[in-house]
Amino acid sequence: KKVVLGKKGDTVELTCTASQKKSIQFHWKNSNQIKILGNQGSFLTKGPSKLNDRADSRRSLWDQGNFPLIIKNLKIEDSDTYICEVEDQKEEVQLLVFGLTANSDTHLLQGQSLTLTLESPPGSSPSVQCRSPRGKNIQGGKTLSVSQLELQDSGTWTCTVLQNQKKVEFKIDIVVLAFQKASSIVYKKEGEQVEFSFPLAFTVEKLTGSGELWWQAERASSSKSWITFDLKNKEVSVKWVTQDPKLQMGKKLPLHLTLPQALPQYAGSGNLTLALEAKTGKLHQEVNLVVMRATQLQKNLTCEVWGPTSPKLMLSLKLENKEAKVSKREKAVWVLNPEAGMWQCLLSDSGQVLLESNIKVLPTW
């Protein structure tokens, strides 16, 4: 008996070939001997089966002795043994129809779980193997689960169902809803304008939700809300904004915030959350602000940084085009009685300058 695998919703063509290369009488029946379709001369006739409106054949092939049964919009319950009667012969074809669906929405938040469920006909014992867009293979039976979805899991999942040494392939498009970056850090000199951008890692036709930026200033004992906003059809509208700092928010995606100036009291870290309509959970992006200030008070030249710096960052003070006078893995450095000239305060990571502030020291007479 020939075995054919089909996919739910697809179209399948079951073949039946006569030895004579001409149009002769044929019938297709199911295992209950109920006629599905056949011919009467050059006319297609249909029986009382459940497939009535979904069954067809190719009249153009009859003259060549081919009498296929075409079943459109396959259903799991179409799984059956189909019998083609032609020239006093019976050709049997076993059709097994499978369906593979994501048990929830195909748009999932980062960190959520994806469950793929296989619908299969009774009596079948298929195995399933799925390959994620990043090349990870998972195997299972009726259900496959992937926990803690990551951004790289966005894309087309290719799943192969194996039954009776036959294969059928499913492709499922999964969109992982996340920000492009989980965390970002902005380095600014005191007084400079600060821009925070929160690009999303996905695109959808219409995006609706609401969000908030909470800020934990290094100098503050507790965090506070800086801004709340709505997102409707991709348009951003501010609901509430703190008066200090005077934040501005863009009305278009990607989400974008502007702080008029970097000040030590704003240095710290923020957490932007975005709750999307009809989704449980929230998207998060952390943003950090490091602020540098170089000052000269009487005979003391000081350079300070505020905000979340890593312990391996180096803070230096140097006279232009000279070796560093002082270099420390600390958040403040100073030079007593500095020489006249242009001094540079540098915040660097393994030799790469992240932030630089210049201050002119005038000669003392």
Epitope: Q193, E195, K232, N233, E235, S237, V238, Q248, M249, G250, K251, K252, H256, T258, P260
Partner: antibody, heavy 118, light 107 residues
């Protein structure tokens, strides 16, 4: 062809009211944000108000906040601007504009003139 | 509100000249900037959006550039029909604000 036709302008005394209308055609009105922009005689352009698509969020310039109300009737493909407590400085040509998908004002009507004078 | 400062307020040029108009925002507005052309007694015409994207039907002699706070509109070779007033518009957030305009006159 996308078209915007303003009407309702005219001469009004200070403190009076006027309602401007803008009839839209040639596009799916309900899916686009719409705005009013004005231009005082011999001056530059000044944004007045915007109403988002079918959500209906409204935004106003500080100079008109509390006095002007923007609204839309999607069933009639019409945008409105209700102007109350009119002042001499509201004298201008008022343009109706359509926003594109990127929220820029891409199509403008020919304008209707509002004169506030005693 | 974000202030938009346009310069120059007026300029005289000849047909064929390269003309540059600048617009400065009082704070960063990404590339959320549009340019409009207005002729006397007419409604403004939309030229450029997202700082550098030409609106369909606008001649390629017009170009825009810039990001953050500084933006430029350039007409590579001025044509007789280009004599008009040009406005920039910040579309970063509300209230939307226009520059005060630059009048391009015939020398």
């Amino acid at each position: 062809e996308v078209q915007l036709l303003e009407s309702g302008g005219g001469l009004v005394q200070p403190g009076g009211s006027l309602r401007l209308s803008c009839a839209a055609s040639g596009f799916t009105f309900s899916t686009y944000a719409m705005s009013w922009v004005r231009q005082a005689p011999g001056k530059g352009l000044e944004w007045v108000s915007t109403i988002s698509d079918n959500i209906g969020n409204t935004y106003y310039a500080d100079s008109v906040k509390g006095r002007f109300t923007i609204s839309r009737d999607n069933s009639k493909n019409t945008l409105y601007l209700q102007m109350n407590s009119l002042r001499a400085e509201d004298t201008a040509v008022y343009y109706c504009t359509k926003d594109n998908e990127d929220y820029y004002m891409d199509v403008w009507g020919k304008g209707t003139t509002v004169t506030v004078s005693s | 509100a974000i202030q938009m400062t346009q310069s120059p307020s007026s300029l005289s040029a000849s047909v064929g000249d390269r003309v540059t108009i600048t617009c400065r925002a009082s704070q960063g507005i990404r590339n959320d900037l549009g340019w409009y052309q207005q002729k006397p007694g007419k409604a403004p015409k939309f030229l450029i959006y997202a700082a550098s994207t030409l609106q369909s039907g606008v001649p390629s002699r017009f170009s825009g550039s810039g990001y953050g706070t500084d933006f430029t509109l350039t007409i590579s070779s001025l044509q007789p029909e280009d004599f008009a007033t040009y406005y920039c518009l910040q579309d970063y957030n509300y209230p939307r604000t226009f520059g005060q305009g630059t009048k391009v006159e015939i020398k």
